[in-house]
């Protein structure tokens, strides 16, 4: 056969689907690799061919589209399972070709099992809700295209093993789940089960997502530098180790980049010759507010180092702040004999 543009195994599209549920999988060629869509390709006389390699096998084989009740079918650029079985797990390839053109890509499909509380190896999307922010909603994801708009499915929402009913502040509203006022206790995994009829059969779609309650933008403030501050003076003798922590609190801000850095005499530590090390640690509160600590360390400080300006800087989407550390050289204690002599007025 003639050469085919092989895009290899697209591991970025690690598709996971639940056992015994419908799954519709679009050929990734048209979404990520080619500059034209399926309709254009079809109009140009190109044919889409599907085949697969079973898990732990090397042999590529055609997909059996003649199974009872059309369990596996193809519609335009979509491969349908109605429903999936555990042994459908494998690498699937879609190939677009005619006599003069060929392009193909493979992708892994994993059929996973869930337990009665919807626990599974499925990677869960995370939806962040602002704490005490008023009504916020999550929507049952990835159910488009499974049934026509004329079909009215039933949707049941669960938190873990439990149907969401009579909750204080969470109300199921069809495809949406409304949080009247999100609290820390609302953190967790939420599952929607969509049930719909098709050709005399009943199918279920299960979708689980993780809700994480985070700090509200209403409460967000610019970075707060807790250390260095005006109350602590770093007083050292030459030869001692100088350790100055810069501790900064950042309110949670969606998609904000939090930065902390030191300057020494107005320059970044990398741009000066002194032997300085910076160690950073990060901790988060339950609402994902962040505390960053950068410890500036000079193993053997010189009298010259003790005259420098050490400034901690912090920046987030809410603003930029800076604070200088109070560093000074320790005055050596006067020698005992001299002190006595001076005390008696000796010359």
């Amino acid at each position: 056969s003639e050469r085919c543009d092989d895009w290899g195994l697209d591991t970025m599209r690690q598709i996971q689907v639940f056992e015994d549920e419908p799954a519709r999988i679009k050929c990734p060629l048209f979404e990520h690799f080619l500059k034209f869509n399926y309709s254009t390709a079809h109009s140009a006389g190109l044919t889409l061919i599907w085949y697969w390699t079973r898990q732990d096998r090397d042999l590529e084989e055609p997909i059996n589209f003649r199974l009872p009740e059309n369990r596996i079918s193809k519609e335009k650029d979509v491969l349908w399972f109605r429903p999936t079985l555990l042994n459908d797990t494998g690498n699937y390839t879609c190939m677009l070709r005619n006599t003069t053109y060929c392009s193909k890509v493979a992708f892994p499909l994993e059929v996973v099992q869930k337990d009665s509380c919807f626990n599974s190896p499925m990677k869960l999307p995370v939806h962040k809700l602002y704490i005490e922010y008023g009504i916020q909603r999550i929507t049952c994801p990835n159910v488009d295209g499974y049934f026509p708009s004329s079909v009215k499915p039933t949707i049941t929402w669960y938190m873990g093993c439990y149907k969401i009913q009579n909750f204080n502040n969470v109300i199921p509203e069809g495809m949406n789940l409304s949080f009247l006022i999100a609290l820390i206790s609302n953190n967790g995994n939420y599952t929607c089960v969509v049930t719909y009829p098709e050709n005399g059969r009943t199918f279920h779609l299960t979708r689980t997502l993780t809700v994480k309650v985070v700090g509200s933008p209403k409460n967000a403030v610019p970075p707060v530098i807790h250390s260095p501050n005006d109350h602590v003076v770093y007083e050292k003798e030459p030869g001692e180790e100088l350790l100055i922590p810069c501790t900064v609190y950042f309110s949670f801000l969606m998609d904000s980049r939090n930065e902390v850095w030191w300057t020494i005499d107005g320059k970044k530590p990398d741009d000066i010759t002194i032997d300085v090390t910076i160690n950073e640690s990060i901790s988060h509160s339950r609402t994902e507010d962040e505390t960053r600590t950068q410890i500036l360390s000079i193993k053997k400080v010189t009298s010259e180092d003790l005259k420098r300006s050490y400034v901690c800087h912090a920046r987030s989407a809410k603003g930029e702040v800076a604070k200088a550390a109070k560093v000074k050289q320790k005055v050596p204690a006067p020698r005992y004999t001299v002190e006595l002599a001076c005390g008696f007025g000796a010359t």
């Epitope: 009665s116 509380c117 938190m159 093993c161 439990y162 909750f167 204080n168 502040n169 969470v170 953190n187």
Partner: antibody
């Protein structure tokens, strides 16, 4: 170690109500459900309903709808089961039980209270 | 609701012998089945969940098997402390339901 401690035995007249308490010791890391199960003398176990104290969610078995009310006081880590319009066949030991989390499939009854005997007699 | 039927109602076994208890569901419950042990005057204790997974601290002589509608609890070598009533429970569908129990007594 989480423990569930229930209130003491009760003797009630037919037509009256009883309220059994179940206090949890050990603060949970995340939401959990308290289940109520009863057992008539010499009989099997019968699930009555549950409550999720931190979220307020609850549900009751069809058989007890309209007669049972399960509530919780988060501040004292105590759940309550109230059964009204008592009749002699409600004579039973009433148990509360719980799991560690809302997500533990098959382990929603892994910690049990000691049981509360409710006798309904005229 | 799903009806759970246990058999036999009473099982007479000598210490050291094997005991096999059955539980049947009126419809498939997949592997969503638990077993509990209850001794006189005590609360039930979780033995097995997921049809075959032993709960924390349960001795290896207790094992569970089955899926769908037919389940078995096996006690490989009965100890004196194992004489009790055993209940199965399905948690596949609400309401969660228990079997009527099997009493394991000393022969």
């Amino acid at each position: 170690q989480v423990q569930l401690v229930q209130s003491g035995a009760e003797v009630k007249k037919p037509g009256s109500s009883v309220k059994v308490s179940c206090k949890a010791s050990g603060s949970p890391a995340e939401p959990y459900a308290i289940q109520w199960v009863r057992q008539a003398p010499g009989q099997g176990l019968e699930w009555m309903g549950y409550i999720i104290p931190s979220l307020g969610g609850y549900d009751y078995a069809q058989k007890f709808q309209g007669r049972v009310t399960i509530t919780a006081d988060e501040s004292t880590s105590t759940a309550y089961m109230e059964l009204s319009s008592l009749r002699s066949e409600d004579t039973a030991v009433y148990y509360c039980a719980r799991g560690q989390t809302l997500y533990a499939s098959g382990r929603q009854f892994d910690i049990w209270g000691q049981g509360t005997l409710v006798t309904v007699s005229s | 609701e799903i009806v759970m039927t246990q058999s036999p109602a009473t099982l007479s076994v000598s210490p050291g012998e094997r005991a096999t208890l059955s539980c049947r569901a009126s419809q498939s419950v997949s592997s969503n089945l638990a077993w509990y042990q209850q001794k006189p005057g005590q609360a039930p204790r979780l033995l097995i969940y997921g049809a075959s997974t032993r709960a924390t601290g349960i001795p290896a002589r207790f094992s569970g098997s089955g899926s769908g509608t037919e389940f078995t609890l096996t006690i490989s070598s009965l100890q004196s402390e194992d004489f009790a009533v055993y209940y199965c429970q399905q948690y596949n569908n609400w309401p969660w339901t228990f079997g009527q129990g099997t009493k394991v007594e000393i022969k």
